[in-house]
């Protein structure tokens, strides 16, 4: 492990931007730790406000966590020559609130990107595709980790946060090769309808600790490779027949449904029947009712149709205030 002091080289934010002579291939930026043997550079908890310019060309794993980057402009990692080996980039907890289109361009080997724990008030639709073309060059990304990227309420823009994230995931169909997507802890109220259709290679999808109330308009049909679907700690009340059938039709999937406020009324009957026969749900014996009050803490697998009733809907003339 080594660390180095200042140098004179520079790298562009954009292809046309200012630059100087290319970096020495093995030098380590100031405030960073480098291991050529491990192909790793760590610039961690150093209050960096920009991505270091003099990154060694051998870097395969780059940790830029715990900094104060604020904004990632287009070409933030573009270098001459390019960082052709960079495969894993961790930017978590670096106070990013703006990721622009093309921020990760010119990283031909980038397989894993972690932007977790950054309050992303602005995520460009072209952050991952790098282009505003309707079909752009495929991104090399295989794992995209976007846990807890929701900004505080006072920094949220007019458009929905869910929509902003969805636009970045589907733009240019660039993420067709994505295997892992983590979107936990983002206060999602819904999952935009077309997102999963554009991510056909997903094997692992984490939507835990959001505020999802329903999956009625979400289609899992395309996700034939899906192995793990994490829906723990949401606000799900019931899964309807269409969703149950789609999940059952996925050949490899394991679904995690713990800690949702299941409503055990007549609408739950199909889900209970399905739970009793499916092998898809992990820990299904832990699922319990939250509502109505009389059913609280009852185990879903132990319910029968007689337990699952709905209060009759009174005609308006008989309703009281």
């Amino acid at each position: 492990t080594s660390s180095a002091s200042s140098s004179s080289s520079s790298a562009p934010f954009l292809a046309s931007a200012a630059s100087a002579q290319p970096p020495l291939p093995d030098q380590c930026p100031a405030l960073c730790e480098c291991s050529e043997a491990a192909r790793t550079v760590k610039c961690v908890n150093r209050n960096l406000t920009e991505v270091p310019t003099d990154l060694p060309l051998y870097v395969r794993n780059l940790f830029l966590t715990g900094n104060q980057l604020a904004v990632l402009p287009a070409g933030a990692f573009a270098r001459r020559p390019p960082l052709a080996e960079l495969a894993a980039l961790n930017l978590s907890g670096s106070r990013l609130d703006e990721v622009r289109g093309g921020a990760f361009e010119h990283l031909p080997s980038l397989r894993q990107l972690d932007l977790s724990h950054n309050p992303l008030a602005y995520l460009s639709p072209f952050a991952f595709s790098g282009s505003n073309a309707s079909i752009s060059a495929p991104s090399p990304l295989v794992e995209l980790i976007l846990n807890h990227i929701v900004p505080p309420d006072d920094k949220r823009q007019n458009r929905s946060f869910e929509g902003m994230v969805a636009a970045a995931l589907v733009a240019g169909r660039a993420l067709q090769g994505l295997h892992l997507l983590e979107l936990a802890s983002n206060h999602f109220l819904y999952l935009p309808r077309d997102v999963l259709a554009q991510l056909p290679s997903l094997r692992y999808l984490d939507l835990s600790n959001n505020s999802l109330v329903s999956l009625t308009y979400v289609s899992f049909r395309n996700l034939t490779h899906l192995e793990s679907l994490h829906l723990e700690d949401n606000a799900l009340k019931v899964l309807h027949n269409g969703t149950l059938a789609e999940l059952q039709g996925l050949p490899h999937v394991r679904v995690f449904l713990d800690n949702n406020p299941w409503v055990c009324d007549c609408h739950m009957a199909d889900m209970v029947t399905w739970l009793k026969q499916t092998g898809v749900v992990q820990g299904k014996d832990r699922l319990t009712c939250a509502f109505p009050e009389k059913m609280r803490n009852r185990v879903l697998l132990e319910l029968n149709s007689a337990d699952l009733d709905c209060d009759p809907i009174l005609p308006p003339s008989l309703q009281t205030s």
Partner: antibody, heavy 120, light 111 residues
């Protein structure tokens, strides 16, 4: 009181070299990025170069890239600009200026400037 | 490179009267989270000084007769009542990307 004091300017022939210095006081120098900005006689302001607080990032205007080198010594509260292969068009007053970051920043403190004259 | 075009290039104002300077960028310098446009005043024989940061935020110690507005590509610096000490050249500057660039400057004189 925040103070930035430039030095090292002077008369130099085309192709020659100069090293400018900027001495900082009145603030924690190592917490701030620093810029060089220049102003040719009777002209407007032109950004020249930037160095981040910990010397991890360096940026240059196309007009000076490959000829100028920015550096700093946080232990000495000093910023430097090594200028090589000087040209007539490099004649200007050179200011050092402080910023909290490159893109999210602005020039919130300036020195009085040092004059560089390139002439044969 | 982003080009900033200031208008007018010069103006002559009677003390106590308002003044307005426009700065137009060749592309947007705003995002939904920040506006990358700042204003400076360079008084005769002095270095520039920061007046307004991020389009509309008054720098500490700057009189409140100065104000800034705008987003995207169009920005305005206003002086509600010009005083003799306001003479000099006003510059807008963006920090959207490298290279940082300045407007060509607007010279304010007192009538």
């Amino acid at each position: 009181e925040v103070q930035l004091v430039e030095s090292g300017g002077g008369l130099v022939q085309p192709g020659g070299s100069l090293r400018l210095s900027c001495a900082a006081s009145g603030f924690t120098f190592s917490n701030f990025g620093m810029h060089w900005v220049r102003q040719a006689p009777g002209k407007g302001l032109e950004w020249v170069s930037y160095i981040s607080s910990g010397s991890t990032s360096f940026y240059y205007a196309d007009t000076v890239k490959g000829r100028f080198t920015i550096s700093r010594d946080n232990a000495k509260n000093s910023l430097y600009l090594q200028m090589n292969s000087l040209r007539d068009e490099d004649t200007a007053v050179y200011y050092c200026a402080r910023t909290n970051s490159l893109l999210r920043g602005f020039f919130d403190a300036w020195g009085q400037g040092t004059t560089v004259t390139v002439s044969s | 490179d982003i080009v900033l075009t200031q208008t007018p290039l010069s103006l002559s104002v009677t003390p106590g009267q308002p003044a307005s300077i426009s700065c137009r960028a060749s592309q947007s310098v705003s995002s939904s989270s920040y506006t990358y446009l700042h204003w400076y005043l360079q008084k005769p024989g002095q270095p520039p000084q920061l007046l307004i940061k991020s389009a509309s935020n008054l720098e500490s110690g700057v009189p409140d007769r100065f104000s800034g507005s705008g987003s995207g590509t169009d920005f305005t610096l206003k002086i509600s009542r010009v005083e003799a000490e306001d003479v000099g050249v006003y510059y807008c500057q963006h920090s959207w990307e490298i290279p940082l660039t300045f407007g060509q400057g607007t010279k304010l004189e007192i009538k």
